[in-house]
């Protein structure tokens, strides 16, 4: 480790005196930092000597000597005070720049250690410091403002009490830069825009940044627009706003608009699309099939997507029949806006009753006219079955009527013994009716079919069962001939 002579750590001299600082090491040594022209530097073997014949207050500072060849990287330092009664301060820099929350060193060095007790930091022209400015003082280094804030970027002076009066240093300008977290924040409104040719339109591009050094521009397709910029400061951020106002839009104004802002951290952009149309429009669509089938008792949501400009002047859901004159309850109708020009309308139909099958129409109106979208709702029912014994053309006939939706198909079973329902083990014979006669088939209603089983002689110890099924379920009816006639059994549910 090098050694400095005189031994220090401090040396106090008067202005005009000669000062010699000798640094001696095992190998070659050198003095740190830029040496002012007032010093003479020469080497003398393993030592380096700094000398001045006329010390001034400006020589006040710490002088450090290092030994480059020393693997431990040791150094020695001596602090020189040149105590000038007229100059209590030596200011090493007139401007200091730090980032917010860093400690800021204001390098005003006291030229006389005796004055330390009476030092203070003030703002330019003796103004007090900002409230809660947390600072400390080191005679070797100057004043340190701890965790400097942006607002503490001020002009400061160091003050020392000399003979009962305050003597100020020259001013030091502190610049506290905000830590820029990223590119400026952007908003471009509206997110999309539709106008009829000849209407007025406005697009606003605004950017905000933590400090004032940032740029913003608005671009139409690939053309940068020349728009006057409005600047503001609020919520502790700088705002720049570009407003494009178009009195009467035409097709050439349509296209992509990009709002672009940049700062030292980079660029940020956001875009919107402007569509110019010849006239008002109103389009209705649905992702659902317009023909709906739902099992009775279940629920259904009918959904319509609307694209419109200008906005809707009216809309409603209507039940067009055929069963009753009831209308959908308003509380079951729901509207959500996806964005300015697209909306979704939903009609909720919970626990559907037979009288609620039929046509449901959504109607909407804007200056472009009326539009309607109609759903057809058919309810699905499990089959209901009944069997009667009758005589047709003199022949005994079992007549099975099955009613449901979709159209049920019919199967006859003959089984041994008297039973309410044939099970597989008892079945003696099965007849499938491929084409039962359709008795009724009205829109939105159950389909009723009829199947005949002609039986010359019904065997008394046997059961005849008509079974019907469709995609919803099945139903059956059992017929048991008895000596005095015949007996029928609906199945036990």
């Amino acid at each position: 480790i090098p050694v400095i002579e005189p031994s220090g750590p401090e040396l106090v001299v008067k202005p005009g005196e000669t000062v010699t600082l000798r640094c001696v090491g095992n190998g070659s040594v050198e003095w740190d930092g830029p040496i002012s022209p007032h010093w003479t530097l020469y080497s003398d073997g393993p030592s380096s000597v700094l000398t001045t014949n006329n010390a001034t207050f400006q020589n006040t500072r710490t002088y450090r000597c290092t030994e480059p060849g020393d693997p431990l990287g040791g150094s020695a330092a001596i602090h020189l005070y040149v105590k000038d009664p007229a100059r209590p301060w030596n200011v090493l820099a007139k401007e200091v720049v730090v980032f917010e929350d860093q400690d800021a060193l204001l390098p005003c060095l006291l030229t006389d250690p005796v004055l330390e007790a009476g030092v203070s930091l003030v703002r330019l022209r003796g103004r007090p410091l900002l409230r809660h400015t947390n600072y400390s003082f080191s005679p070797w280094h100057g004043f340190i403002i701890h965790r400097a804030k942006f607002i503490q970027g001020q002009d400061y002076q160091c003050s020392a009490l000399m003979g009962g009066r305050k003597v100020m240093s020259i001013s030091i300008r502190l610049k506290v830069q905000k830590v820029i977290p990223g590119p400026p924040a952007l908003t471009l409104v509206p997110a999309e825009l539709v106008r009829i040719r000849g209407e007025a339109a406005q697009i606003v591009c605004s950017a905000s940044n933590i400090d004032v050094d940032f740029d913003v521009f608005l671009q139409h397709n690939t053309t940068k627009l020349a728009i006057p910029q409005r600047s503001d400061f609020h919520d502790n951020r700088y705002q720049k706003v570009l407003t494009l106002s178009l009195g009467q839009v035409d097709f050439q104004h349509a296209g992509n608009y990009s709002c672009v802002a940049s700062n030292v951290q980079g660029k940020h952009s956001t875009s919107m699309f402007f569509q110019v149309v010849e006239s008002a429009y109103l389009d209705l669509s649905s992702e659902q099939n317009l023909i709906q089938e739902v099992t009775v008792g279940e629920g259904l949501n009918l959904k319509v997507m609307v694209e419109a400009y200008p906005g809707l002047q009216g809309f409603n859901w209507t039940y067009l029949g055929p069963f009753s004159d009831h209308q959908p309850e308003p509380k079951l109708a729901n509207a959500t806006t996806k964005d300015t020009y697209r909306h979704t309308f939903t009609l909720s139909l919970p626990r559907l009753k037979p009288s609620e099958a039929g046509r449901y129409s959504f109607l909407a109106r804007n200056p472009g006219g009326w539009r309607a979208l109609t759903f057809e709702l058919t309810l699905r029912y499990p089959p209901e079955v009944s069997v009667i014994w009758t005589s047709i053309n003199g022949s005994g006939t079992l007549l099975c009527a099955a009613s449901g939706y979709p159209q049920p198909n019919v199967t006859w079973l003959q089984c041994a013994g008297h039973t309410d329902r044939c099970d597989e083990a008892q079945v003696l014979q099965v007849w499938v009716d491929p084409h039962p006669e359709v008795l009724s088939q009205e829109p939105f209603q159950k389909v009723t079919v009829q199947s005949l089983l002609t039986a010359e002689t019904l065997e008394h110890n046997q059961t005849y069962e008509c079974r019907a099924h469709n995609s919803v379920g099945s139903g059956s009816w059992a017929f048991i001939p008895i000596s005095a006639g015949a007996r029928t059994h609906p199945p036990d549910e």
């Epitope: 409230r131 809660h132 804030k149 607002i151």
Partner: antibody, heavy 122, light 111 residues
Framework: EVQLQQSGPELVKPGASVKISCTAS????????MNWVKQSPGKGLEWIGD????????TYNQKFKGKATLTVDKSSTTAYMELRSLTSEDSAVYYC???????????????WGQGTSVTVSS | DIVLTQSPASLAVSLGQRATISCRAS??????????IHWYQQKPGQSPKLLIY???SLESGVPARFSGSGSATDFTLNIHPVEEEDAATYFC?????????FGGGTKLEIK
């Protein structure tokens, strides 16, 4: 809910001292400056000083140096103000007020105690 | 010390109308576009309540009918529309340097 609960009213004789307390609840006591403000009918609101509970550092209004002493007990989250050598001029309502610290340096007093009335009378 | 002068000392405003209170500082209380003036409301027998900080920022929970503006040495508190419950004394306060100082107060009466 943030609350600053002050001690009750005081009736004291001239020349005596009084110590007022202010207990903070539902706030991180050490993250704020605790201010003391005097309100007297003739003088409006006057700032006495503040204390930073974190390190006990104080700042006083020159006018109240020697009159008021601010202390803090971190364990009980209580701030104290002692007023000494009381005269009729010290009769007033004294408030403690929390000063909110924000990154932006907006030092405003966002929570106030209910006030302690001090009457100096022989 | 920075002196804050409020005007008027008192004013009477009809329900639903606008109340405007001014606060003038003896020197600038602004720096870097940050305006260190705050507004408080005090009702009889109660402690002051912060309404606006940094000249124009509304304290949480304060109705939007209160607004503040101004910079450097001239600041304004506006209340519009005035409601019955706004009858109180309003104070401005600076916090740019020690000691913090308060205005003399403006007493608002509702007609």
């Amino acid at each position: 809910e943030v609350q600053l609960q002050q001690s009750g009213p005081e009736l004291v004789k001239p020349g005596a001292s009084v110590k007022i307390s202010c207990t903070a609840s539902a706030i991180t006591f050490t993250d704020y400056y605790m201010n003391w403000v005097k309100q007297s009918p003739g003088k409006g609101l006057e700032w006495i000083g503040d204390i930073y509970p974190n390190n006990g550092g104080t700042t006083y209004n020159q006018k109240f140096k020697g009159k008021a002493t601010l202390t803090v007990d971190k364990s009980s989250t209580t701030a104290y103000m002692e007023l000494r050598s009381l005269t009729s001029e010290d009769s007033a309502v004294y408030y403690c007020a929390r000063e909110k610290i924000t990154m932006e340096y907006y030092y405003a007093m966002d929570y106030w105690g209910q006030g302690t009335s001090v009457t100096v009378s022989s | 010390d920075i002196v804050l002068t409020q005007s008027p000392a008192s004013l009477a405003v009809s329900l639903g109308q606008r109340a405007t209170i001014s606060c003038r500082a003896s020197e600038s209380v602004s720096s870097h576009d940050i305006h260190l003036i705050h507004w408080y409301q005090q009702k009889p027998g109660q402690s002051p309540k912060l309404l606006i900080y940094a000249a124009s920022s509304l304290e949480s929970g304060v109705p939007a009918r209160f607004s503040g503006s101004g910079s450097a040495t001239d600041f304004t508190l506006n209340i519009h529309p005035v409601e019955e419950e706004d009858a109180a004394t309003y104070f401005c306060q600076q916090s740019i340097e020690d000691p913090p100082t308060f205005g003399g107060g403006t007493k608002l009466e509702i007609k």
